[in-house]
Interface confidence: medium
């Protein structure tokens, strides 16, 4: 078959057109999908007649044309082109095989920015380590919740790495989970080991009921022990009713004889009789991720005399269905400030949240948000994304609820919404955030930090920068320099000191002329590339009496690299016994290419030096 020539679809630094051509072949249906794949998805690959004549862009291809590409073809594409393909597959809702997903993920080397545009199930194959930091991981795992985790068998390495990363992201320490944690884990909750089942039975057992596939041995034993123990949510087996048995559906196989013998025999008989008539109980419902409000909760009328006239302590004695039936959502919204003072259980708070969700499906108004109090802990990042929080008072009130705990995904999302709403990270906001989370500033990406106005830098304390990396300090330093520019020498140094990890060489040279006596801890945080050009005299002036500390750090960067660049004679003038400088009679040639490869300067011995000197002399005479 003669193939027409094709120009590369994307410019790719010296790469031949072959990859693009192959891509056209598979994307236009020249490569047929396997029968099983086409059969499984109900989609069929397009025929190949004459489709290569005018190469279209990927987004114009039909699902049939996009289906069934083999991995070999993808490996020839640029990362950008792979991303384009992934987005098109998502837009067209093309069902992909595990192999295709794994292959695409492998080619998306950089962590993708636009997670929402990618096929949901593709995320299962991305490395969660690429999404570190509360905001990045929250976005990633919020999407994973919606993906079909069961595409991956339980033993698959991709699946095994997701759970620990998700637990770390959601801030779960130990084995105690809240209902919100379980909801946030989505299908990954089915992988939680037995110790979680033992310690968090109340919130986890109802989730395990709907897990597809059998629980492992460890989970089964823990579930059996929890059910036999008779704790919530199901209570002792001796008190179970037919509806309890219904609710337990998927866990029935793990019960074991001791438990079955404890269930009232009349209940077992009635349940067996009903389930033989209605076998639908065998299909565990998959919609357990949201708090479930059973039919009777929603439909039951409020008993007479129980209609709530106001939100008060009497409501703690209401059963869940009574709260649902007797508390008016509008009343709740107007009296939200009272909820926090009343010791509702988590289960009751779920009902109240459900009522607010029904009243405000597009997101709560700020008047309600400000008074959420502990109910804020029941909110998911998805809920919070619907909010428009503009008042600093609201932000403070909600941060107060989470005080003393690590930044949760809810808090990360709340802050993100608040800052985006304001358009920049102003001083008051930064003040508030760093008061609650000293490491907040360093959790932002360099791009996000670029929106911090210089005036806000006054709110930053040295400890707020402890965990910042050089890329973040590169962004913050120029802002700090601008903010503190009108201060005199010593005051300026005190303020700028914690930002110096982003300072260029010329600023360090200028500081060395001002007798600042920089301590060694600050010096060790300076950019290596900024320190290297400093002379011995400049470093001596910069450090003042602290220069003696160089000896203790001579093996560590940036001191080690700086020593390698200095003449040994000059180093000896410090009298510290620093070794490793350039010996006398050697000439340093800054061969940047060589240096970039080796990381050390190029040295020429005495022979070549004489030659160079002779050449210099000859050229001067000439």
């Amino acid at each position: 078959m003669a193939l027409p020539t094709a120009r590369p679809l994307l410019g790719s630094c010296g790469t031949p057109a072959l990859g693009s051509l192959l891509f056209l072949l598979f994307s236009l249906g020249w490569v047929q999908p396997s029968r099983t794949l086409a059969g499984e998805t109900g989609q069929e690959a397009a025929p190949l007649d004459g489709v290569l004549a005018n190469p279209p862009n990927i987004s114009s291809l039909s699902p049939r044309q996009l289906l069934g590409f083999p991995c070999a073809e993808v490996s020839g594409l640029s990362t950008e082109r792979v991303r384009e393909l992934a987005v098109a597959l998502a837009q067209k809702n093309v069902k992909l095989s595990t192999e295709q997903l794994r292959c695409l993920a492998h080619r998306l080397s950089e962590p993708p920015e636009d997670l929402d545009a990618l096929p949901l199930d593709l995320l299962l194959f991305l490395n969660p380590d690429a999404f570190s930091g509360p905001q990045a991981c929250t976005r990633f795992f919020s999407r994973i919740t919606k993906a079909n985790v069961d595409l991956l068998p339980r033993g698959a390495p991709e699946r095994q790495r997701l759970l620990p990363a998700a637990l770390a992201c959601w801030g779960v320490r130990g084995s105690l989970l809240s209902e919100a944690d379980v909801r946030a884990l989505g299908g990954l909750a089915c992988d939680l080991p037995g110790r979680f089942v033992a310690e968090s039975a109340e919130v986890l057992l109802p989730r395990l009921v709907s897990c597809p596939g059998p629980l492992d041995q460890d989970q089964q034993e823990a579930a059996r022990a929890a059910l036999q123990g008779g704790g919530p949510p199901y209570g002792p087996p001796s008190t179970w009713s037919v509806s309890t048995m219904d609710a337990l559906r998927g866990l029935l196989p793990v019960l074991g004889q001791p438990i079955i013998r404890s269930i009232p025999q009349g209940i077992v008989a009635a349940w067996r009789q009903r389930s033989s008539r209605d076998p639908s109980w065998r299909q565990p419902e998959r919609t357990i991720l949201r708090p479930r409000f059973r039919r009777e909760v929603e439909k039951t009328a409020c008993p007479s005399g129980k209609k709530a006239r106001e939100i008060d302590e009497s409501l703690i004695f209401y059963k869940k269905w009574e709260l649902e039936a007797c508390v008016d959502a509008a009343l709740l919204a107007t009296q939200m400030d009272r909820v926090n003072a009343i010791p509702f259980t988590y289960e009751q708070l779920d009902v109240l949240k459900h009522k607010l969700d029904e009243l405000y499906p597009q997101g709560y108004p700020e008047s309600v948000i400000q008074h959420l109090g502990y109910l804020f802990l029941k909110m998911s990042p998805e809920d919070i994304r619907k909010w428009n929080v503009t008042s600093l008072e609201t932000l403070k009130a909600l941060l107060e609820v989470n005080k003393g705990h690590e930044m949760s995904p809810q808090v990360a999302t709340l802050i993100d919404r608040f800052v985006k709403g304001r358009g920049q990270l102003d001083k008051d906001t930064l003040d508030t955030l760093t008061a609650f989370y000293p490491g907040y500033l360093c959790s932002l990406s360099p791009e996000e930090l670029s929106s911090v106005p210089p005036s806000s830098i006054w709110a930053v304390r040295p400890q707020d920068l402890d965990t910042c990396d050089p890329r973040q300090l590169d962004v913050l330093y120029p802002k700090a320099r601008l903010a503190f520019q009108n201060m005199n020498g010593s005051e300026y140094f005190v303020k700028i000191q914690s930002f110096l990890g982003g300072a260029p060489t010329e600023d360090l040279k200028a500081l060395s002329q001002q007798n600042v006596s920089m301590d060694l801890a600050t010096f060790m945080k300076l950019r290596t590339d900024a320190v290297l050009p400093l002379t011995v005299a400049e470093v001596q002036k910069l450090l003042g009496p602290h220069v003696e500390g160089l000896k203790a750090e001579e093996r560590h960067r940036p001191v080690r690299d700086w020593i390698l660049r200095q003449r040994q004679d000059d180093l000896d003038t410090l009298g510290l016994g620093l070794q490793g400088g350039i010996p006398n009679g050697y000439l340093v040639l800054d061969l940047s290419m060589q240096e970039a490869l080796s990381g050390t300067p190029c040295l020429l011995g005495p022979g070549p030096v004489l030659t160079v000197l002779a050449l210099l002399l000859a050229s001067t005479l000439a």
């Epitope: 105690l176 809240s178 010791p343 259980t345 988590y346 289960e347 502990y374």
Partner: nanobody
């Protein structure tokens, strides 16, 4: 590890009394609301009485005047004194803690039977 252990349940004639105890470990009562719940066969669990960290108490209407909830912070124990017991008080009684409203921790329960 946060744990609650109930004791004091048993069988009693109508009109009799029982005193339930619940001892907590793994946290202190200083910032906790404690409560007694009960669950009769085939029924949903219901709150009977609760005591706030500031000492204020609340009771469900059906036990007001008959039951008293109290706590001994030094012993990390909460009590439920039940007088004038009725057959409808028969249930499994659970102690519960709302610790900083962040988690609800339950005990294993103690059975009260009134004949």
């Amino acid at each position: 590890e946060v744990q609650l252990v109930e004791s004091g349940g048993g069988s009693v004639q109508a009109g009799g009394s029982l005193r339930l105890s619940c001892t907590a470990s793994g946290f202190t009562f200083d910032d906790s609301d404690m409560g007694w719940y009960r669950q009769a066969p085939g029924n949903e669990r219901e709150l009977v009485a609760t005591i706030r960290s500031d000492g204020s108490t609340y009771y469900v209407d059906s036990v007001k005047g008959r039951f008293t909830i109290s706590q001994d912070n030094a012993k990390n124990t909460v009590y439920l004194q039940m007088n004038s017991l009725k057959p409808e008080d028969t249930a499994m009684y659970y102690c519960a803690s709302l610790w900083l409203r962040r988690l609800v921790c339950w005990g294993q329960g103690t059975l009260v039977t009134v004949s």
